[in-house]
């Protein structure tokens, strides 16, 4: 075994190094001391370290470790934060375009239904945005709300434009009739299915990205235990006490220490792998009715078709509703 | 029949992009993200090794420090002796993860469960009763998945028609992307050291 080089007789080297860590403090002994009070850098002979120095080394070692961890996760963190923001903005843009497409469809095909239709369409897409951002809204309720609101306007403006203003109190009756008579056929149900499937997937995708950020942030800001601090100090700084300033830790030893310090963090590994693979599976399935871009940007067409369906059955509907809602003030329609 | 109501848009560049075949779509961006994430799949298991390789460790020196003394780099003492009479490493591992780590593991388990639930086989997923009285399936055929929209000539086939929106200064990986401040993007040389961490075992 090679003999250790003789320790610095004056601790001068150790002092000049320690001054860089803690300027102005007189904690370094002038000459090597027995060091019986040391708890981490247990000396085999005289040492240039004091108890105070040891404490400072421990603090520095833990800070170094935290910085190394943060630099390790920097690129991954940047990747997820950036994409979470980009996708959220992208989804908002899709919602805005879908609203514009739908409004344009009303303006071009059914100008008599605006501005009320614009209001209902606006409220519907506001609900869509809220849902994507995590609000607890029931998609079926959103779609029913849209068609419940639209039908009275369609009936009074398109199907029965001759109704006097006083007849506008039949709106409540028309809302009820809309569901019971399946006025729009199965279009509302089709929209419910498509919208709920695509928005559910979109929402969970965003939630997953945000959780990814939370995972990295959590491990990024871990505070390492005192035991870990001692092990790191022994590995990185105890050699200095013997005046061995240029010596580096052995690779295998470093791995053992790091595995000890990071035992808890490494437990995340299994779930992190599963997270990435599950996210990949989700993304692979985000097409057709599971792709909100497809579904929302095509909604104007389905809504248009649903109104055409009403118009096609207008004769039959007008007769039925005429009877049903003739006495809407007296009877309450469910 | 309804048509794409393009006349509504003032921002014509959005529409130009809307029909260019090879523009980046949201789905291609998603796939690209997954590919990048997969290079980090071993991030946590590789962390100890990464940190050792990024802190001072004896690589070419004959002698190295094992926590107690100077030893030859390839001797058994290089890994073992320094751990004797020290804090019990096994004990440190047995303590289990910090409460915050346990919490985040629980959250990961929960999201993984949700992701799996959402990723069920995507066969004929729409309710079969969509074809009942009152619904005309037009040219949708049996697979309702194919159709976004309702019936007949109002139908829009959505294959390839929805291109990503130029409104987003989108490819944030490009340093000179419009509206992308250069400080915000770590340069390649700053981050490449860690890029293959996922492949370290």
């Amino acid at each position: 075994q090679p003999p250790p080089p003789p320790p610095d007789a004056t601790c001068h080297q150790v002092r000049s190094f320690f001054q860089r860590l803690q300027p102005g403090l007189k904690w370094v002994p002038e000459t090597p001391v027995p060091g019986s009070d040391l708890q981490v850098c247990l000396p085999k002979g005289p040492t240039c370290c004091s108890r105070k120095m040891e404490e400072k080394y421990q603090l520095t070692a833990r800070l170094n470790m935290e910085q190394l961890l943060q630099s390790a996760s920097m690129e991954l963190k940047f990747l997820i934060i950036q994409n979470a923001a980009v996708f959220q903005e992208a989804f908002e843009i899709v919602v805005r375009h879908a609203k514009n497409y739908t409004n344009a469809m009303f303006k071009n095909n059914y100008p008599s239904l605006t501005p009320q239709a614009f209001e209902f369409v606006g409220e519907f897409f506001t609900d869509v945005s809220l849902y994507i951002l995590g609000s607890d809204i029931n998609v079926d309720d959103m779609v029913n709300e849209l068609f419940d609101s639209l039908f009275p306007v369609i009936y009074t403006q398109l199907m029965n434009p001759g109704l006097p203003d006083s007849a506008l109190d039949i709106n409540e009756c028309l809302r009820g009739a809309r569901r019971d008579l399946k006025v729009f056929g199965n279009f509302p149900k089709l929209i419910m299915t498509q919208v709920s499937k695509s928005l559910q997937v979109t929402r969970i995708f965003l939630q997953a990205l945000n959780l990814g950020i939370e995972v990295i942030n959590t491990t990024d800001h871990l505070k390492f235990s005192k035991d870990c601090g001692r092990m790191l100090t022994r590995m990185w700084y105890c050699s200095y006490c013997q005046g061995l300033m240029m010596v580096k830790p052995c690779g295998g030893y470093c791995n053992v220490v790091m595995q000890g310090c990071m035992a808890g963090v490494v437990e995340i590994d299994k779930y992190w792998r599963e997270y990435i693979l599950s996210l990949e599976e989700l993304v692979n399935g985000m097409y057709r009715i599971y792709d909100m871009e497809n579904v929302l940007l095509g909604l104007f067409s389905t809504i248009h078709d649903s109104i055409q369906y009403v118009q096609k059955n207008a004769g039959k509907l007008t007769t039925t509703i005429g009877k049903l809602c003739a006495h809407s003030q007296q009877r309450q329609y469910r | 029949s309804a048509y794409y109501p393009e006349d509504l848009f003032i921002d014509k560049k959005v529409l130009k992009v809307a029909h260019v075949e090879h523009e980046e779509t949201l789905s291609s961006r998603r796939r690209e993200l997954i590919q990048k994430l997969k290079s980090f799949i071993s991030f946590y298991s590789a962390l100890p090794g990464y940190i050792c390789s990024h802190s001072p460790v004896a690589e070419n020196d004959t002698l190295c420090w094992n926590g107690q003394e100077l030893v030859e780099r390839y001797s058994q003492k290089a890994a073992r002796n320094g751990m004797k009479n020290q804090f019990n490493l096994h004990e440190l591992k047995m303590k289990g993860p910090e409460p915050v780590v346990s919490q985040i593991i629980d959250k990961l388990k929960h999201i993984n469960q949700l992701l799996r639930t959402m990723s069920m086989p995507k066969g004929r997923v729409l309710d079969k009763n969509l074809d009942e009285e009152g619904f005309e399936s037009g040219d949708c055929g049996d697979d309702e998945d194919e159709c976004i929209g309702g019936s007949g000539d109002g139908m829009i086939k959505v294959k390839n028609q929805l291109r990503f929106l130029a409104e987003l200064a989108y490819d944030l990986d490009v340093d000179d992307a419009p509206g992308n401040s250069q400080q915000a993007t770590p340069k390649d040389n700053e981050i490449s050291t860690f890029h293959n961490l996922g492949n370290v075992h």
Epitope: L133, D136, N138, D141, G176 | -
Partner: antibody, heavy 121, light 111 residues
């Protein structure tokens, strides 16, 4: 005539339960979200709970979460509020209110006259 | 969830104008959420005056108007009348879709 009529209020001891009902008429009940709002004597309005048109989503104020349950029976045009583990601070006039929308809270365009709940030993 | 902030009182002479402010946060009024205003007389149920920040239900006089900017909303009453003496509440909802009310403002018509 659009109307909401609350019932079920009264004097109750702390820790006990009470169930409020609200009968709706004159509008398509199943098409609108519904709410309970309360007002303690001499105080302002405090929202208690809401339910969407289908009953698929429910919402609660922090002060009642876990103790109160909102529900609706669209076939009977009736809204309910089951109040358990009542406390003195739950003493108030409880109003039933109709939302102008179906999917979630927006604005309350029809209100009942209120029913007084007094929690005291 | 925290309440929206309103001044406790406001007053004016008949014919004058009164404005009541309502301040929220970025998670309620400041979001895309609408603000509503209610009028309440003592011992009576509240009545909707304004919804969607500036829309008036039929039957509400056009002396009442609402506006919203950022995280604040306001109700203006022009040409104050004796019957306008009442309590006024603003209301919105937060990102969890839970409703928030303001603390209420007592409007007094002087003289």
């Amino acid at each position: 005539q659009v109307q909401l009529q609350e019932s079920g209020g009264g004097l109750v001891q702390p820790g006990r339960s009470l169930r409020l009902s609200c009968a709706a008429s004159g509008f398509t009940f199943s098409s609108y979200a519904m709410h309970w709002v309360r007002q303690a004597p001499g105080k302002g309005l405090e929202w208690v709970s809401a339910i969407s048109s289908s009953g698929g989503s429910t919402y609660y104020a922090d002060s009642v979460k876990g103790r109160f349950t909102i529900s609706r029976d669209n076939s009977k045009n009736t809204l309910y509020l089951q109040m358990n583990s009542l406390r003195a601070e739950d003493t108030a006039v409880y109003y039933c209110a109709k939302d102008r929308r179906g999917s979630h809270a927006d604005a309350f365009d029809v209100w009942g006259q209120g029913t007084l709940v007094t929690v005291s030993s | 969830q925290s309440a929206l902030t309103q001044p406790p009182s406001a007053s004016g002479s008949p014919g004058q104008s009164v404005t009541i402010s309502c301040t929220g946060t970025s998670s309620d009024v400041g979001l895309m959420h609408n603000v509503s205003w209610y009028q309440q007389y003592p011992g009576k149920a509240p009545k909707l005056l304004i919804y969607k920040s500036s829309s008036r239900p039929s039957g509400v006089p056009d002396r009442f108007s609402g506006s919203k900017s950022g995280t604040s909303a306001s109700l203006a009453i022009t040409g104050l009348q004796a019957e306008d003496g009442a309590d006024y509440y603003c209301q919105s909802y937060d990102s969890s879709l839970r409703v928030v009310f303001g603390g209420g403002t007592k409007v007094t018509v002087l003289g």
